[in-house]
């Protein structure tokens, strides 16, 4: 099957504060069609939060999630 029919997700601004790590369930990079780089965190309550991929806390959460996958 080819890539899923999922809507394009872009970040136009980033969260200004660090989300508690235990709130996060998953993550993905924003679409290659977006003008701004971004990581989208999915919370356990199914909210999507935009984060700046250059922030160290964002990278830590991503690598921790990757290790636990």
């Amino acid at each position: 099957s080819l890539a899923a029919d999922t809507p394009t997700a872009c970040c136009f601004s980033y969260t200004s504060r660090q989300i508690p790590q235990n709130f996060i369930a998953d993550y993905f990079e924003t679409s290659s069609q977006c003008s701004k780089p971004g990581v989208i965190f999915l919370t356990k309550r199914s909210r999507q939060v935009c984060a700046d991929p250059s922030e160290e806390w964002v990278q830590k959460y991503v690598s921790d999630l990757e290790l636990s996958a």
Epitope: A3, Y27, P37, S54
Partner: antibody
Framework: QVQLQQPGAELVKPGASVKMSCKAS????????IHWVKQTPGQGLEWIGA????????SYNQRFKGKATLTADISSSTAYMQLSSLTSEDSAVYYC????????WGQGTTLTVSS | DVVLTQSPATLSVTPGDRVSLSCRAS??????LHWYQQKSHESPRLLIK???QSISGIPSRFSGSGSGTDFTLSINSVETEDLGMYFC?????????FGAGTKLELK
């Protein structure tokens, strides 16, 4: 561990097309964009474009629009780049790389276009 | 497109030297500037991400600095295994672009 596997070489005739593969393993394929980069001795490293495996979204360098077509297959965790109407100018090493920071790269596919 | 200009094109070094490689952007790339090392017949390898962030497995002698349009990769005591090409790259805007590279060679 994270790996991007690419075939080592492709030999294709001028005017033909080629479809290169980049098989990802060791991470969730849909979490990161896959980028394609061309390297030639004269031109250095050139970004061709990127594909988002989650939904198939693509972004292309204007220079490669009409030349390259990027796709992704979630079921096999493989990204593809098709290059069409090949000429000797397309002979190069083509790399796939993962994510904004290009933290992992494939070994590269050497494309030779020759009759 | 953002043009990245690297200098010098070639740097001749002696093991133990401290060296600085420059990358200048034609417009601001914010913090989205990365450095790669490429040895002959190998794939590029990420050395520094987001201007100054270190990468697991990369020796601590490599460091990055700068902001906006002016960036530097420093190697504080060059070893022979560091010889090769060094590229900067920006991921702030499409198309992502690379510098032409700096070749690090033995004096």
């Amino acid at each position: 561990q994270v790996q991007l596997q690419q075939p080592g070489a492709e030999l294709v005739k001028p005017g033909a097309s080629v479809k290169m593969s980049c098989k990802a393993s060791g991470y969730t394929f849909t979490s990161y964009n896959i980028h394609w980069v061309k390297q030639t001795p004269g031109q250095g490293l050139e970004w061709i474009g990127a594909v988002s495996p989650r939904n198939g979204d693509t972004s292309y360098n204007q220079r490669f629009k009409g030349k390259a077509t990027l796709t992704a297959d979630i079921s096999s965790s493989t990204a593809y780049m098709q290059l069409s109407s090949l000429t000797s100018e397309d002979s190069a090493v083509y790399y796939c790389a993962r994510g904004y920071g290009y933290d992992y790269w494939g070994q590269g596919t050497t494309l030779t276009v020759s009759s | 497109d953002v043009v990245l200009t690297q200098s010098p094109a070639t740097l001749s070094v002696t093991p133990g030297d401290r060296v600085s490689l420059s990358c200048r952007a034609s417009q601001s790339v914010s913090k989205y500037l990365h450095w790669y090392q490429q040895k002959s017949h190998e794939s590029p390898r990420l050395l520094i991400k987001y201007v100054s962030q270190s990468i697991s497995g990369i020796p601590s002698r490599f460091s990055g600095s700068g902001s906006g349009t002016d960036f530097t990769l420093s190697i504080n005591s060059v070893e022979t295994e560091d010889l090769g090409m060094y590229f900067c790259q920006q991921s702030n805007s499409w198309p992502h672009t690379f510098g032409a590279g700096t070749k690090l060679e033995l004096k």
